[in-house]
């Protein structure tokens, strides 16, 4: 049957948790991603910035996590308005601050 | 200003039972969940076990299930411990602690009793 | 259930950056929490949610965690500093809390 929420959400955590601490050289090379306002629709928004960061498989695996979070297909160049279009960061650090938020999301009961 | 006083500790003899209560004053009680958290002599923290703001819910640490109950009466603001069956083990400093309540009771303990002393011998 | 791995005792002169370690299998998968306790009084809380620091908390307390390891930092260290430490998490799949054994900070 699906997985249930909690548990995908859980699953998604603990695979960043696994890449960023896998990573001895800069995670995808240090490509730079749109950061994203860390709010309703965050998913699709993570999804986007993510998906424009090309042959990087520490994050194929995200990739497709994202999109199970996500009610839209997502595909490169396509960016919503949760983006903020004026700063650029490193996937290391996007990887970082989206699994504090995800953490805390957990904690609250929002699994969707 | 925002407080936690613990009560109820003392001497008391093996198989026997105690009640600790906690007075909370200076923020609403009934949005916090609350825990009981001891110390045994010159050991770490252990925690005891966690009620919900509203009372729905009770969590315990494996080594006092069974033999202690929390609960609270938000029209007094008021915690206690109902400790039952008690073992030299049970020795401890006793804390009252809060914590937002979550979803999941994720939150950090930001406000901490003195803590009462219970001791269990014979 | 969960365990937590702390170091029983760190040692630091004053002034130099202590570094306190709490380790767990996936722990940056979990919010952190770090206590501080001085002996005869009841502990406070020093970091939250992996690095927050409550306002009343001097700017030396640091906080991070990745894959096996939390980590609290305390820079410029002074003699107050001097006092047990505790790490502490949820564990989600027993609904319990788990602290670390503490470690022991002696400022020489």
């Known amino acids: 049957g699906p997985v249930p929420p909690s548990t995908a959400l859980r699953e998604l955590i603990e695979e960043l948790v696994n890449i960023t601490q896998n990573q001895k050289a800069p995670l995808c090379n240090g490509s730079m991603v749109w950061s994203i306002n860390l709010t309703a629709g965050m998913y699709c928004a993570a999804l986007e910035s993510l998906i424009n960061v090309s042959g990087c498989s520490a994050i194929e695996k995200t990739q497709r996590m994202l999109s199970g979070f996500c009610p839209h297909k997502v595909s490169a160049g396509q960016f919503s308005s949760l983006h903020v279009r004026d700063t650029k960061i490193e996937v290391a650090q996007f990887v970082k601050d989206l699994l504090l938020h995800l953490k805390k999301l957990f904690r609250e009961g929002q699994f969707n | 200003q925002m407080q936690l006083v613990e009560s109820g500790g003392g001497v008391v003899q093996p198989g026997r039972s105690l009640t600790l209560s906690c007075a909370a004053s200076g923020f609403e009680f009934r949005t916090y969940g609350m825990h009981w958290v001891r110390q045994a002599p010159g050991k770490g923290l252990e925690w005891l076990g966690v009620?919900?703001?509203?009372?729905?819910?009770?969590h315990y640490a494996d080594s006092v299930k069974g033999r202690f109950t929390i609960t609270r009466d938000n029209s007094k603001n008021t915690l206690n411990l109902q400790m039952n069956s008690l073992r030299a083990e049970d020795t401890a400093v006793y804390y009252c602690v809060r914590a937002p309540q979550w979803y999941l009771t994720a939150e950090a303990f930001d406000l901490w009793g003195q803590g009462t002393m219970v001791t269990v011998s014979s | 259930s969960y365990i937590l791995t702390q170091p029983p005792s760190v040692s630091v002169a004053p002034g130099q950056t202590a570094t306190i370690t709490c380790g767990g299998n996936l722990i940056g998968a979990r919010l952190v929490h770090w206590y501080q306790q001085k002996p005869g009084q009841a502990p406070v809380l020093v970091i939250y949610?992996?690095?927050d620091r409550p306002s009343r908390i001097p700017e030396r307390f640091s906080g991070s965690n990745s894959g096996n390891t939390a980590t609290l930092t305390i820079s410029d260290v002074e003699e107050g500093d001097e006092a047990d430490y505790y790490c502490?998490?949820?564990?989600?799949?027993?609904?319990?809390?788990?602290f670390g054994g503490g470690t022991k900070l002696t400022v020489l």
């Open positions: 502490q998490v949820w564990d989600y799949s027993s609904n319990t809390y788990v």
């Open positions: 009620i919900w703001y509203d009372g729905s819910n009770t």
């Open positions: 949610d992996d690095s």
